[in-house]
């Protein structure tokens, strides 16, 4: 049984204010069962960026169909980028549990930074 790896291929993503940023995350295994969430930052103060199951995230859309049985692509797009969006983004796999899901593995993170404005 293959060990789950969380792949975030870009260490650094340069973005432009007002544009849409795509943050990539793929997994190498469908197991264990449980959701993948996106956070900015680490530790207790990290900010939830996207949770498919609950919450309202009007600027975030998924690249792939997260409800599909065999989906292994958890990449997201964030629209209308502002300077407040800079930071390091992590996709995090949770193992399904009761009563709460348990964090299982995190991707290495992608730092989002502002690039030069287009001339």
């Amino acid at each position: 049984e293959e060990e789950l790896q969380m792949i975030q291929p870009e260490k650094l993503l340069l973005v432009t204010v007002g544009k849409t940023a795509t943050l990539h995350c793929t997994v190498t295994s469908l197991l264990p069962v449980g959701p993948v969430l996106w956070f900015r930052g680490v530790g207790p103060g990290r900010e939830l960026i996207y949770n498919q199951k609950e919450g309202h995230f009007p600027r975030v859309t998924t690249v792939s169909d997260l409800t599909k049985r065999n989906n292994m692509d958890f990449s997201i797009r964030i629209s209308s980028i502002t300077p407040a969006d800079v930071g390091t983004y992590y996709c995090v796999k949770f193992r399904k549990g009761s009563p709460e899901n348990v964090e299982f593995k995190s991707g290495p993170g992608t730092e989002m930074a502002l690039g030069a404005k287009p001339s």
Epitope: L30, T61, S64, D65, T67, K68, R69, N70
Partner: antibody
Framework: AVTLDESGGGLQTPGGALSLVCKGS????????MNWVRQAPGKGLEWVAG????????YYGAAVQGRATISRDNGQSTVRLQLNNLRAEDTATYYC?????????????????WGHGTEVIVSS | ALTQPASVSANPGETVEITCSGG?????YGWFQQKSPGSAPLTVI????KRPSDIPSRFSGSKSDSTGTLTITRVQAEDEAVYYC??????????FGAGTTLTVLG
């Protein structure tokens, strides 16, 4: 109670197009993926097409790929299947199905409800 | 297509199992009962082992390794039907088995 009512079947001409509509009630339509399944006379079940709960993602069986379009209107609680360039092999009873809170289009293990079906006959 | 036996038979009151294999790597199975050709199928099990509220508890489903199993305990004459399994393949396409005809003897 959950109901799925299909309409739009009937006698169709080869090379023509058909549009089937399924109206769902008794459940939160926008929360469930939907699929179309057909059964030719004397044959088994065949998956035709599916669509995610929000309508962003669509899936098609090999027999209709390139000829079919599935879409949904969550406000009206309807899902539509359009099938072009009809062939005799498209003759079948077409069933609308609902996924039971898991999976998406094509994930047939998640089907928990079926419509009564609408019969389509493709003949000249 | 998924692989399931063409036919099974049982006496009333017996237990019968129908197997299904060939789903994708994240395979789960659903089971659909069709009592006569042209009549609408009925879901008896979905998502491996979930049972719709109107289905008797005599119907149960399970999955071991890559094989799904529909179990009907205390088989009754009214259970005579064709049972189809359904899943998705590794490409995500929907796929059914060819159907298993259950004959209730006696």
């Amino acid at each position: 109670a959950v109901t799925l009512d299909e309409s739009g079947g009937g006698l169709q001409t080869p090379g023509g197009a058909l549009s089937l509509v399924c109206k769902g009630s008794g459940f939160t339509f926008s929360s469930h993926a939907m699929n179309w399944v057909r059964q030719a006379p004397g044959k088994g079940l065949e998956w035709v097409a599916g669509i995610s709960s929000d309508g962003r993602f669509t899936y098609y069986g090999a027999a209709v790929q390139g000829r079919a379009t599935i879409s949904r209107d969550n406000g009206q609680s309807t899902v539509r299947l359009q099938l072009n360039n009809l062939r005799a092999e498209d003759t079948a009873t077409y069933y609308c199905t609902k996924n039971g809170g898991c999976g998406s289009g094509g994930d047939l293990d998640c089907i928990d409800a079926w419509g009564h079906g609408t019969e389509v006959i493709v003949s000249s | 297509a998924l692989t399931q036996p063409a036919s099974v038979s049982a006496n009333p009151g017996e237990t019968v199992e129908i197997t299904c294999s060939g789903g994708g790597s994240n395979n789960a199975y659903g089971w659909f009962q069709q009592k006569s050709p042209g009549s609408a199928p009925l879901t008896v099990i979905y998502d491996n082992g979930k049972r719709p509220s109107d289905i008797p508890s005599r119907f149960s489903g399970s999955k071991s390794d890559s094989t799904g199993t529909l179990t009907i305990t205390r088989v009754q004459a009214e259970d005579e039907a064709v049972y189809y399994c359904g899943s998705a393949d590794n490409s995500g396409a929907g796929v059914f088995g060819a159907g298993t005809t259950l004959t209730v003897l006696g």
